[in-house]
């Protein structure tokens, strides 16, 4: 029951995560016009990975899109990179996990192949997960920089009498929908992982015990459970089931309702 | 077509109080930010106060801040400019304006004259 | 608060004559989000209200003749008149739309000899 609960939450996080890194992806604000110690502008900037928008008091929003490939700085290249990878790897990972859950069956899986999907799937979160992080961290690094460097000269402009001010960016919404959705679907990919652990089948499956009484040989073999002699090395009293035979956690489904928002 | 109709003239004394309403027609009222603008005596223009099409946003000038409310009812297509502490240099004639693209003002009221004077 | 200031206060001209008016304001008025110049130019004839000219400091309001020209960018703008008639006698003025408190200018009052 555990093994499924670990594997099914974690395939629900690990989707809800998912779909965060494909919301941050696409969103338009990564970086928003700072707005504290500035001059009231009536007119808000905010730039995505794919287009830099302005929102005007008027209400009329206009936004273009980064139709250059080679004239944008190497650094939004690499955070796009990370972020398309991130969504790529988890999409491959929901689709190997959602083959790989006990609840779900299919032919006549073995136990051992759903467990290697299970981990297959829980190190592609993983990474994704990592590879948003990544991407938002780079990001808000590059912003930062940028930030400061702005302070420096925030008034440029000719002996002082006319100035112009430079637009200051801070962090945008996106990175904060980009860091919180990599790490669930990281956390996702961990608690696969760990499912991954609990679906492996036993090594051995001991289905009889010899006992020898002196003088006499006498083989019990008690249905269903090893009897533990205290000698060797199988000192641990475990639950043996015949081959075809279905554990609680394979026959429980694991229903649960996700509105990502 | 595009209209807007601002209350009658007054005339108030210094301190007083006076609410200024500017009733909309011939478009989605709701879907534009609007603004009042005042005309001094002497021909000045003056931007008063900015409001946003969902009323969430609100700007003034700094001579009016504090004094001036700018709201507006989206269900009655009206919006409004309630003043108080009334001075002199209030003396001008108010218009109230649609902002279009570039903040700009498209549509402007025929303008109600205020006069304060003791 | 941004200061407008326009140049000259007055202007006498002949009807067909080319008119140039300038505009010039404290701090930039460029937009780097979308290289968009926030002012805009407005007519006032007598007894009316202000009507829209131009907005972006280029862009002409639909209705309006085309011999109304905005050009200009940063802190420098100019209005110009190709060929000035009768019912172009009007004071026109110039707006900062960028920085709150949006400002006017004194406005320049164009008069037809």
């Known amino acids: 029951m555990a093994v499924t609960a670990c594997q099914g939450l974690g395939f629900v996080v690990s989707l809800i995560g998912i779909a965060g890194i494909i919301a941050a992806t696409c969103m338009d604000q990564w970086s928003t016009q700072d707005l504290y110690n500035n001059p009231v502008t009536a007119v808000f900037n905010y730039q995505g990975l794919w287009r830099s928008c302005v929102r005007e008091s008027s209400g009329f929003t206009e936004c273009r899109g980064y139709f250059t490939l080679l004239g944008l700085p190497a650094m939004l290249q690499a955070v796009r990179a990370l972020m398309i990878v991130g969504i790529v790897l988890g999409a491959i990972g929901l689709l190997v996990s959602i083959f790989a859950l006990k609840c779900i069956r299919i032919g006549s899986m073995e136990d051992s192949a759903k467990a290697n999907m299970t981990l297959t799937s829980g190190i592609m979160f993983i990474v994704s997960g990592l590879c948003a992080i990544a991407g938002v961290s780079v990001f808000a690094n590059m912003l930062v920089t940028n930030f400061w460097m702005s302070t420096a000269n925030m008034y440029t402009g000719m002996g002082g009498m006319v100035q112009t001010v430079q637009t200051r960016y801070t962090f945008g919404a996106a990175l904060f929908v980009g860091w919180v959705a990599g790490g669930l679907t990281l956390i996702g990919g961990v608690m696969m992982c760990i499912a991954c652990r609990g679906l492996a089948p036993e090594e051995t499956n001991y289905k009889a015990v010899s006992y020898h009484a002196s003088g006499h040989s006498v083989a019990y073999k008690p249905g269903g459970f090893k009897a533990s002699t205290g000698f060797g090395s199988n000192t641990k009293n475990k639950k043996i089931y015949d081959g075809g035979a279905r554990t609680e956690d394979e026959v429980q489904s694991y229903p649960s309702k996700h509105d990502y928002v | 077509d595009v209209k807007l109709v601002e209350s009658g003239e007054d005339l108030v004394k210094p301190g007083g109080s006076l609410k200024l309403s500017c009733a909309a027609s011939?478009?989605?009222?709701?879907?534009?930010?609007m603004s009042w603008v005042r005309q001094t005596p002497e021909k000045r223009l003056e931007w008063v106060a900015y409001?946003?099409?969902?009323?969430?946003?609100?700007y003034y000038a700094d001579t009016v801040k504090g004094r001036f409310i700018i709201s507006r009812d989206n269900a009655r297509n009206t919006l409004y400019l309630q003043m108080n502490s009334l001075r002199s240099e209030d003396t001008a004639m108010y218009y109230c304006?649609?902002?279009?693209?570039?903040?700009?003002?498209?549509?402007w009221g025929q303008g109600t004259t205020l006069t304060v004077s003791s | 608060d941004i200061v407008m200031t326009q140049s000259p206060s007055s202007l006498t001209v002949t009807a067909g004559e080319k008119v140039t008016l300038s505009c010039k304001s404290s701090q930039s008025l460029l937009n780097g989000g979308n290289q968009k110049n926030y002012l805009t130019w407005y007519q006032q004839r007598p007894g009316q209200p202000p009507k829209l000219l131009i907005y972006w400091a280029s862009t002409r309001e639909s209705g309006v003749p085309d011999r109304f020209t905005g050009s200009g960018s940063g802190t420098d703008f100019t209005l110009i008149i190709s060929s000035v008639q009768a019912e172009d006698l009007a004071v026109y003025y110039c707006?900062?739309?960028?920085?709150?408190?949006?400002?006017f200018g004194g406005g320049t009052k164009l008069e037809i000899k």
């Open positions: 304006a649609r902002v279009y693209f570039g903040n700009s003002l498209d549509y």
């Open positions: 707006q900062n739309d960028y920085y709150y408190p949006w400002t």
């Open positions: 011939g478009f989605t009222f709701s879907n534009y930010a």
């Open positions: 409001v946003s099409s969902g009323g969430d946003y609100i």
